[in-house]
């Protein structure tokens, strides 16, 4: 088989994970995962609640082959993409009259990666080169995180990427396809 069909080639290989330790384990609240709370409507006192289960974010999936130069993983890997609005929120009209989720006051929450997992992948190379083993770091779960005054707003504006989670001495990981590219593909479908 040739390699010409592999277009998912923007995956970063992370040879050693030691320099990017996983966040300390936290108790998982399953109620926050994949739930549409309150039927999409805000509770009576949307910003007074301290119950984190009221804030949910959507976990989508992203599957790709891992590549390193001409080499490609034997199997694709699947990770989570953290997306969506962390409710509860108020539905207010925008300037041109279409509905828009907007929280004009109260705490600001973002859906960001919570936990990561290391997965070992075998890379197959053309030309009879020996297979290589690598570890990749994949998003394993998402959570709604409250923005504090210590957060830079620009760091969290891109909800679906690891850029939302500042990490010392690390460049943001490129996605196989940018959110904008994905959106263009989605728009073509309608």
């Amino acid at each position: 088989q040739g390699w010409q069909a592999f277009k998912n080639d923007a995956t970063e290989i992370i040879p050693e994970l030691g320099e990017y330790p996983e966040p300390p384990p936290e108790l998982e609240n399953n109620k926050t995962m994949n739930r549409a709370e309150n039927g999409g409507r805000p509770p009576h006192h949307p910003f007074e609640t301290k119950d984190v289960s009221e804030y949910s974010c959507r976990e989508l999936h992203f599957t790709r082959y891992v590549t390193d130069g001409p080499c490609r993983s034997a199997k694709p890997v699947t990770e989570l993409v953290c997306s969506g609005q962390c409710g509860p929120a108020r539905l207010l009209p925008n300037a041109i009259g279409r509905g828009k989720w907007w929280r004009p006051s109260g705490p600001d929450f973002r859906c960001i990666p919570d936990r990561y997992r290391a997965q070992r992948v075998q890379l197959l190379c053309p030309g009879g080169e020996a297979p290589r083993a690598r570890k990749v770091r994949l998003v394993a779960s998402c959570k709604c995180k409250r923005l504090t005054r210590f957060h830079n707003q620009s760091e969290l504006k891109d909800f679906g990427t690891e850029a939302a989670r500042p990490q010392k001495g690390r460049k943001p990981r490129p996605r196989a396809r940018s959110a904008k590219a994905n959106q263009a593909e989605l728009e073509n479908a309608y």
Epitope: G2, A5, N8, L60, H61, F62, T63, E185, N188, A189
Partner: nanobody, 114 residues
Framework: EVQLVESGGGLVQAGGSLRLSCATS????????MSWFRQAPGKQREFIAT???????DYIDSVKGRFTISRDNAKNTVYLQMNSLKPEDTAVYYC????????WGQGTQVTVSS
């Protein structure tokens, strides 16, 4: 929004055949590689096969020569033809696109009896 609807599963005797379909919408199907995965009870979801946008295919060793993945870009559908089925092929089968965000479909149950 990406939507994936798998169908064609069922109960079949060992050595029999099934053809699974995955109807997609919400993205430009012809531009994306498509994969089939499966998940047996109590096990992790595992990769089975990929068909790339250019038509090349890729399979795990355990299904090579028995399963064939194909696509119909006009119908936005990917197929998995499964022949010489074995009891260990019993699982829920899922399809997914590569390189775009999606939510897993409901899958289609395949049960192979001995």
């Amino acid at each position: 929004e990406v939507q994936l609807v798998e169908s064609g599963g069922g109960l079949v005797q060992a050595g029999g055949s099934l053809r699974l379909s995955c109807a997609t919408s919400g993205f430009t199907f012809s531009r994306f590689d498509m994969s089939w995965f499966r998940q047996a009870p109590g096990k992790q979801r595992e990769f089975i096969a990929t068909i790339f946008s250019g038509g090349d295919t890729d399979y795990i060793d355990s299904v090579k020569g028995r399963f064939t993945i194909s696509r119909d870009n006009a119908k936005n559908t990917v197929y998995l033809q499964m022949n010489s089925l074995k009891p260990e092929d019993t699982a829920v089968y899922y399809c997914c696109p590569l390189g775009i965000e999606y939510a897993w479909g409901q899958g289609t149950q395949v049960t192979v009896s001995s």
